[in-house]
């Protein structure tokens, strides 16, 4: 058993039929020593008497706010979550695995430049009763500052009859530098509690890995005289860290038709300019890259031909 | 990435080329390591990360763009004293482009050089033959010394007299390239920020 | 500490009609409250929750058939536009102040919806 | 999300013993009730929490199960126990929210 913050413990579990589980002593919060009854949750059954409660947990029924009691006045609580471990795995409930960019994926993260500053977010199909908190930190046995906020409701998706929920947060790391080379990674831990199930989940990376530009900007075609070609020109996206010179970006360029299965023609190039051969009813997209570092690329920005 | 290249103008900053050659060449050396050691710790979440030029050169600080001086996160060993040599620095006379910064880049590849030429010799001796290194990373490296032009002494390489364990030869492989490769990322934003100065 | 549901009559198909539920013993804001039908003969099917802070959550079947919400002593249930299949007895029910999806251990008598052309 | 009773209806004997089984659709841990619901009348809270009774029930009704399998046990049968006996989940009530279809019971 241990502490997850002040008057809420969490008991792990082995989690298999018939498990013995583990015998809990509980101790009031107070200098009284006698007249005290304990009882759990909203019920009125007096569990015991005494200063402390000894008690076995083994499922969630035994789980749950157990209150000290004296004469009709409440002395303390003990909040008691439940962490389960089933064939030696911690539980995995509460988030969905999002099996990108592997199978036990539950935590993703991307930033859009080399500040320090990222998101991360997870999913799961439970709504209600549900709190989530995170940590972050560079490295993990000499561990370096990383801030974060609290964790939001981002989006709300509907999958044929259930809905699916994202929740997402924002980090900082606290003395970043944009040039450094990392050699510790980041450390994300989410604690998630749903009713009285303790479950957490990590993600490590480095910020370079998870690196994916916004967008590039101001996305424009010129025509070029007596030609079917136009010259598209763009700009580093405002949120790309700067000196643009140094975190430099490569572009592709793409010439889609209105078709999916038309053939797609596509130019790479460092500029932030090209020139392509605009078709009727097509569109011309741009995405970047870090040039030097091939993380992910930024999703299109798009303007049609005509 | 397999993109179409475009080759620099002669008139461009000398080392530009060579530095592209470089991250082409070790990027390519560490996906062929990764695959053809795949039952091998290779990859960024299984290996460790050491740098083997911690505390002999400082690179990124003496290579830091003129606009990150501002940040403190950035200066934490910062070397402010510089040597005037290399011909890289061409004529140009930006305070950025500190022949201290060149001078670190050249110490990087001279060490990396000696512990890649070492690594090679134990791999030459494997029974199994599994993996070597690709010469051409090896002349690429020797290109941008060459470019780089800084008169340094020569270090010995290192002879092991015991019998070399090809297991950890090929997880130090692992360790050496993933840090070549990100010194080579670092290199690459410096050529093409002093290019563009 | 009990609920009382109002407002069940005769309507004729697509009339809109408002179901109230009034609680006493108790505050809404330390609750969540449940809406849950019955056709005759037939077993309970929940409609919608509203909990303590207000939020409403809905069965997937409702699809903005029916709209939960409440004041400081009552709680509706506004049915939009009523079919046959909507004859039913409505029971308002109480949470037991745990958690926002409960169970349930105050009800209601019921009030009964008959809809007819 | 499926609450599945079985059986849907069960006959027994004053004092005999029924069991009535509920399963549901995926795991719920133990956040199961079960009600009871006679003609007229509204549902009334057995247990709770899978196996907790409810204030003022008598203890010959007595839950069990956890996770897809749960199980209502009454005793000692008694006349005024006929009844419907509804099981409900309230894990969550996207993820796994509704009530069973019910076990009538007619005690002979």
């Known amino acids: 058993i241990w502490e997850l913050k002040k008057d809420v413990y969490v008991v792990e579990l082995d989690w298999y039929p018939d498990a013995p589980g583990e015998m809990v002593v509980l101790t009031c919060d107070t200098p009284e020593e006698d007249g005290i009854t304990w009882t759990l949750d909203q019920s009125s059954e007096v569990l015991g008497s005494g200063k402390t409660l000894t008690i076995q947990v083994k499922e969630f029924g035994d789980a749950g706010q157990y209150t000290c009691h004296k004469g009709g006045e409440v002395l303390s609580h003990s909040l008691l979550l439940l962490h389960k471990k089933e064939d030696g795995i911690w539980s995995t409930d509460i988030l969905k695995d999002q099996k990108e960019p592997k199978n036990k994926t539950f935590l993703r993260c991307e930033a859009k430049n080399y500040s320090g500053r990222f998101t991360c977010w997870w999913l799961t199909t439970i709504s209600t009763d549900l709190t989530f908190s995170v940590k972050s930190s560079r490295g993990s046995s000499d561990p370096q500052g990383v801030t974060c906020g609290a964790a939001t409701l981002s989006a709300e998706r509907v999958r044929g009859d259930n809905k699916e929920y994202e929740y997402s947060v924002e980090c900082q790391e606290d003395s970043a530098c944009p040039a450094a080379e990392e050699s510790l990674p980041i450390e994300v831990m989410v604690d998630a509690v749903h009713k009285l199930k303790y479950e957490n989940y990590t993600s490590s990376f480095f910020i370079r890995d998870i690196i994916k530009p916004d967008p590039p900007k101001n996305l424009q075609l010129k025509p070029l005289k007596n030609s079917r070609q136009v010259e598209v020109s763009w700009e580093y996206p405002d949120t790309w860290s700067t000196p643009h010179s140094y975190f430099s970006l490569t572009f592709c360029v793409q010439v889609q038709g209105k078709s999916k299965r038309e053939k797609k023609d596509r130019v790479f190039t460092d500029k932030t300019s090209a020139t392509v051969i605009c078709r009727k009813n097509a569109s011309i997209s741009v995405r970047a890259q870090d040039r030097y570092y091939s993380s992910s690329w930024s999703e299109w920005a798009s303007v049609p031909c005509s | 990435r397999n993109l179409p290249v475009a080759t620099p103008d002669p008139g461009m900053f000398p080392c530009l080329h060579h530095s592209q050659n470089l991250l082409r060449a070790v990027s390519n050396m560490l996906q062929k390591a990764r695959q053809t050691l795949e039952f091998y710790p290779c990859t960024s979440e299984e290996i460790d990360h050491e740098d083997i030029t911690k505390d002999k050169t400082s690179t990124v600080e003496a290579c830091l763009p003129l606009e990150l001086t501002k940040n403190e996160s950035c200066l934490n060993s910062r070397e402010t004293s510089f040597i005037t040599n290399g011909s890289c620095l061409a004529s140009r006379k930006t305070s950025f482009m500190m022949a201290l910064c060149l001078s670190s880049i050249y110490e990087d590849l001279k060490m990396y050089q000696v512990e890649f030429k070492t690594m090679n010799a134990k791999l030459l001796m494997d029974p199994k033959r599994q993996i070597f290194l690709d010469q051409n990373m090896l002349a690429v490296i020797d290109e941008l010394m060459q470019a780089l032009n800084f008169n340094s002494e020569t270090v010995p390489q290192k002879s092991s007299l015991e019998e070399p364990d090809f297991y950890k030869t090929k997880i130090k492989l692992c360790i050496l390239l993933h840090a070549f490769r990100i010194r080579a990322v670092t290199i690459d934003r410096v050529m093409s920020y002093l290019n563009a100065s | 500490q009990s609920v009382e549901e109002s407002g069940g009559r005769l309507v004729t198909p697509g009339t809109p009609l408002t179901l109230t539920c009034a609680v006493s013993?108790?505050?809404?804001?330390?609750?969540?409250m449940i809406w849950v039908r019955q056709a005759p003969g037939e077993g309970l099917e929940w409609i919608g929750i509203?909990?303590?802070?207000?939020n409403t959550y809905y069965a997937s079947w409702v699809k903005g058939r029916f709209t939960i919400s409440k004041t400081s002593t009552t709680v509706d249930l506004k049915m939009i536009s009523p079919t046959t299949e909507d004859t039913a007895t409505y029971f308002c029910?109480?949470?037991?102040?745990?958690?926002?999806?409960?169970?349930?251990?105050?009800w209601g008598p019921g009030t009964l919806v008959t809809v007819s052309s | 999300f499926e609450l599945t009773q079985t059986p849907s209806s069960v006959e027994a004997a004053v004092e005999g013993t029924v069991t009535i089984k509920c399963q549901a659709s995926?795991?719920?841990?133990?956040?199961l009730s079960w009600y009871q619901q006679k003609p007229g009348q509204p549902p009334k809270l057995l247990i709770y929490?899978?196996?907790k009774l409810a204030p003022g029930v008598p203890s010959r009704f007595s839950g069990s199960g956890s996770g897809t399998q749960f199980t209502l046990t009454i005793g000692d049968l008694e006349c005024a126990d006929a009844a419907t006996y509804y099981c409900?989940?309230?894990?969550?009530?996207?993820?796994?929210?509704?009530f069973g279809g019910g076990t009538e019971v007619v005690v002979v």
């Open positions: 013993g108790f505050s809404l804001s330390g609750y969540t």
């Open positions: 409900q989940s309230y894990y969550d009530v996207n993820a796994g929210y509704g």
């Open positions: 995926q795991s719920i841990d133990s956040w």
């Open positions: 929490s899978a196996s």
């Open positions: 509203i909990s303590s802070s207000g």
């Open positions: 029910a109480r949470g037991s102040g745990a958690y926002i999806s409960d169970y349930f251990n105050v």
